[in-house]
Amino acid sequence: LCQGSNYSTCASCPSCPDRWMKYGNHCYYFSVEEKDWNSSLEFCLARDSHLLVITDNQEMSLLQVFLSEAFCWIGLRNNSGWRWEDGSPLNFSRISSNSFVQTCGAINKNGLQASSCEVPLHWVCKKCPFADQALF
């Protein structure tokens, strides 16, 4: 059975909800509208998912194929160092802030970008196939 933490490795469950894209063992939602970082996070949480936490360079490269020049919010924030929403540090890529207000992370086809969390951007949610299901 698939159940437990959103951040765990998902089992190969068969399908994703409408308007979600299945890639590997996860479902991804690429928004059409734009929101600030906090509103994007709330959107994902309300759908038993989380703002995109990228596990490694391979996942990042694969996802960038689906992205354009437009930046999308991901689950990355600078709280005394850049960390993913699951608490893990960013250690496979670089991101730098050009001002003190740039404390949220975004991604486009070219890579990661620090931004003010207030900027309205597209966002990406990630979850396991079927709501709130992950491998223990």
Partner: antibody, heavy 120, light 107 residues
Framework: EVQLVESGGGLVKPGGSLRLSCAAS????????MSWVRQAPGKGLEWVAT????????YYPDSVKGRFTISRDNAKNTLYLQMSSLRAEDTAVYYC?????????????WGQGTLVTVSS | DIQMTQSPSSLSASVGDRVTITCRAS??????LAWYQQKPGKAPKFLIH???TLAEGVPSRFSGSGSGTDFTLTISSLQPEDFATYYC?????????FGQGTKLEIK
């Protein structure tokens, strides 16, 4: 084309008040931090105030803190600077400026400026 | 507060010359530096951010370099329209401080 047009400058007595406006066009105003920068006659540039996208966060140097208030109306695409307890040293051309995007707080676009003269 | 000091404060040069303006920060600001050009009676014009990245539409004869505390703005071959005052600015944190300016005049 990005356009920033300041207004509201003029002659005011020391201790007086004045409100400057900056009308923005050619970009989505509600996506950008905005700032005021001033230049006293024959002098260099001095940053005066910055406001966040929502208006919830404002920033000032010590020289104007408590006397100047920056605000914005995203529905009207307008930035404001309320200046009170004005002093002779506040005499300057006041420029409205837009950041570079994503909270990159360099001053990428500038208005033409409005002159504020504080004199009795 | 971080202080920005430019040198020289004024400079005379001729069309075609290579010119370098220096900006020094009172402490390490990494690459958080912008450059602006201002002509008399006009608003400043944005030239460079992050110490070396040219703003859109800025001619390639302008270049920026440096990191930490020492930065330079170089104009490789002066054009008549380049005679102006140049300012550096720290853009990471509060207060956003400017250098005092360098006035570039025709020799």
């Amino acid at each position: 084309e990005v356009q920033l047009v300041e207004s509201g400058g003029g002659l005011v007595k020391p201790g007086g008040s004045l409100r400057l406006s900056c009308a923005a066009s050619g970009f989505t105003f509600s996506r950008y931090y905005m700032s005021w920068v001033r230049q006293a006659p024959g002098k260099g540039l001095e940053w005066v105030a910055t406001i966040s996208i929502s208006g919830g966060n404002t920033y000032y140097p010590d020289s104007v803190k408590g006397r100047f208030t920056i605000s914005r109306d995203n529905a009207k695409n307008t930035l404001y600077l309320q200046m009170s307890s004005l002093r002779a040293e506040d005499t300057a051309v006041y420029y409205c400026a837009r950041e570079g995007g994503y909270g990159n707080l360099w001053f990428a676009y500038w208005g033409q400026g409005t002159l504020v003269t504080v004199s009795s | 507060d971080i202080q920005m000091t430019q040198s020289p404060s004024s400079l005379s040069a001729s069309v075609g010359d290579r010119v370098t303006i220096t900006c020094r920060a009172s402490e390490n600001i990494y690459s958080a530096l912008a450059w602006y050009q201002q002509k008399p009676g006009k608003a400043p014009k944005f030239l460079i951010h992050q110490a070396k990245t040219l703003a859109e539409g800025v001619p390639s004869r302008f270049s920026g370099s440096g990191s930490g505390t020492d930065f330079t703005l170089t104009i490789s071959s002066l054009q008549p329209e380049d005679f102006a005052t140049y300012y550096c600015q720290y853009h990471y944190g509060i207060p956003f401080t400017f250098g005092q300016g360098t006035k570039l005049e025709i020799k």
